[in-house]
Interface confidence: low
């Protein structure tokens, strides 16, 4: 906290300029009028502040939007927003893409901090669901941030922003996620045709039914074992050996490495050893 | 993301004088205002002169009529003139696009200005 104190004479500050860095905190506190700051904010980026400055900068706009700062503001805080906590930045309301890129520039290169977090919880919950461009902003900036969604959030996500999503986005979804992610991706390319809609949909299919499986089966995709593998157990257990030798296609060879390991274990479990043998691949049910 | 490399420092009789030179490298360097600072032991880094974009500058008290700061943005470079050193102005010194006010602020090795009595 700064004391307030009369600002020298001639130093009262006309405009937001180089010549700030040399006030002491004391004087850029008593000299820098607050709305001034608020409307050349743009300035402060450009200037070479250093940390304990910035902090003074800040007090100044929390006095004068104590309800939060304006769009206006927020949008050109740059590299003080470094310095606000996730309690400012709730009160925030931020509408526009521009505005939510210019502070994910601010933190890029780095993991996710909480007030990012919570930046993007605030534009999300304003917009009222995760569309297209949306995602394609946030999955640019953190490939990981879909996953990092609970399944309750992920429900908003409307099946046109699925295009936005790429196979990298997906790694590290859990199986509650992808359940309901297939829905949506399902629905999104729906209207490709079967080599096409397979390269699309493959990434999802962690979230697919047993009905799905069956249906891929008939459309030689040939799945590789590292999608196969992360199939839900439940949706594998039902298809016959002729279906999923159809579903991998060349790949089947792959079977026998994995046959240890879930979901094949226990789908070798689940057949007849007569109708494993056809396989040739040697796995004992 | 901008490189700097500092040098010019040494050692230097009390009065002497040093020219230091600071290298960037990347595009955008013109268009960044700069910093000379400088951190002697136990003491935090502090900022002694800068130079805008358009190159108005700026000096410490300590400093003022006794260091020059200029830049050429053709060379990509930043200089600092420092007349009548005292040894009080021995430090380490760097330069810097825009101080350490950003947590993972790429500083480089900064040059060792020493002056003796």
């Known amino acids: 906290e700064v004391e307030k104190t009369a600002c020298p004479s001639g130093k009262k500050a006309p405009e937001i300029d180089e010549s700030l860095i040399f006030y002491k905190k004391w004087e850029l506190e008593a000299c820098v009028d607050a709305a001034l700051l608020a409307t050349q904010m743009d300035r402060v980026n450009a200037i070479p502040f250093t940390y304990e400055q910035l902090d003074v900068l800040k007090h100044k706009l929390d006095e004068l939007y104590p309800q939060g700062y304006p769009e206006s503001v927020i949008q050109h805080l740059g590299y003080l927003f470094l310095k606000m906590s996730p309690e400012d930045i709730r009160k925030w309301n931020v509408t526009s893409l521009e505005t939510l890129k210019a502070l994910l520039e601010v933190n890029k290169g780095h993991e996710m901090s909480p007030q990012v977090a919570t930046l993007i919880d605030r534009f999300v919950k304003g917009r009222g669901q995760l569309d297209k461009d949306t995602l394609d902003t946030l999955t640019a900036f953190y490939p990981g941030y879909l996953c990092s969604l609970s399944p309750e959030e992920l429900s908003s996500v409307p099946p046109s922003s699925i295009w936005a999503v790429r196979p990298q986005d997906l790694d590290t979804c859990d199986p509650r996620q992808l359940d309901v992610l297939y829905p949506k991706a399902r629905l999104a390319f729906q209207n490709m045709n079967g080599s096409e809609y397979f390269v699309k949909i493959q990434s999802f299919l962690g979230g697919a039914p047993t009905e799905d499986l069956k249906a891929l089966s008939q459309q030689n995709v040939s799945m590789d074992l590292a999608t196969f593998m992360k199939l839900r157990t439940d949706a594998v257990l039902p298809l016959t050996v002729a279906e999923v030798q159809k579903l991998l296609g060349p790949h089947v060879e792959g079977l026998k490495a994995e046959e240890r390991h879930r979901p094949v274990r226990d789908w070798i479990l689940r057949q007849r050893q007569d109708d494993l043998d056809t396989l040739g691949l040697g796995l004992q049910g | 993301e901008v490189q700097l490399v500092e040098s010019g420092g040494g050692l230097v009789q009390a009065g002497g004088s040093l020219r230091l030179s600071c290298a960037a490298s990347?595009?955008?360097?013109?268009?960044?205002?700069m910093g000379w600072y400088r951190q002697a032991p136990g003491k935090q880094r502090e900022l002694v002169a800068a130079?805008?974009?358009?190159?108005?500058?700026n000096y410490a008290d300590s400093v003022k009529g006794r260091f020059t700061i200029s830049r050429d943005n053709a060379k990509n470079t930043v200089y600092l003139q420092m007349n009548s050193l005292k040894p009080e102005d021995t430090a380490v010194y760097y330069c810097?696009?825009?101080?350490?006010?950003?947590?993972?602020?790429?500083w480089g090795q900064g040059t060792q200005v020493t002056v003796s009595s």
């Open positions: 810097n696009t825009r101080s350490p006010r950003v947590p993972n602020d790429s």
């Open positions: 990347g595009s955008t360097f013109s268009s960044y205002p």
């Open positions: 130079i805008s974009s358009g190159g108005s500058t």
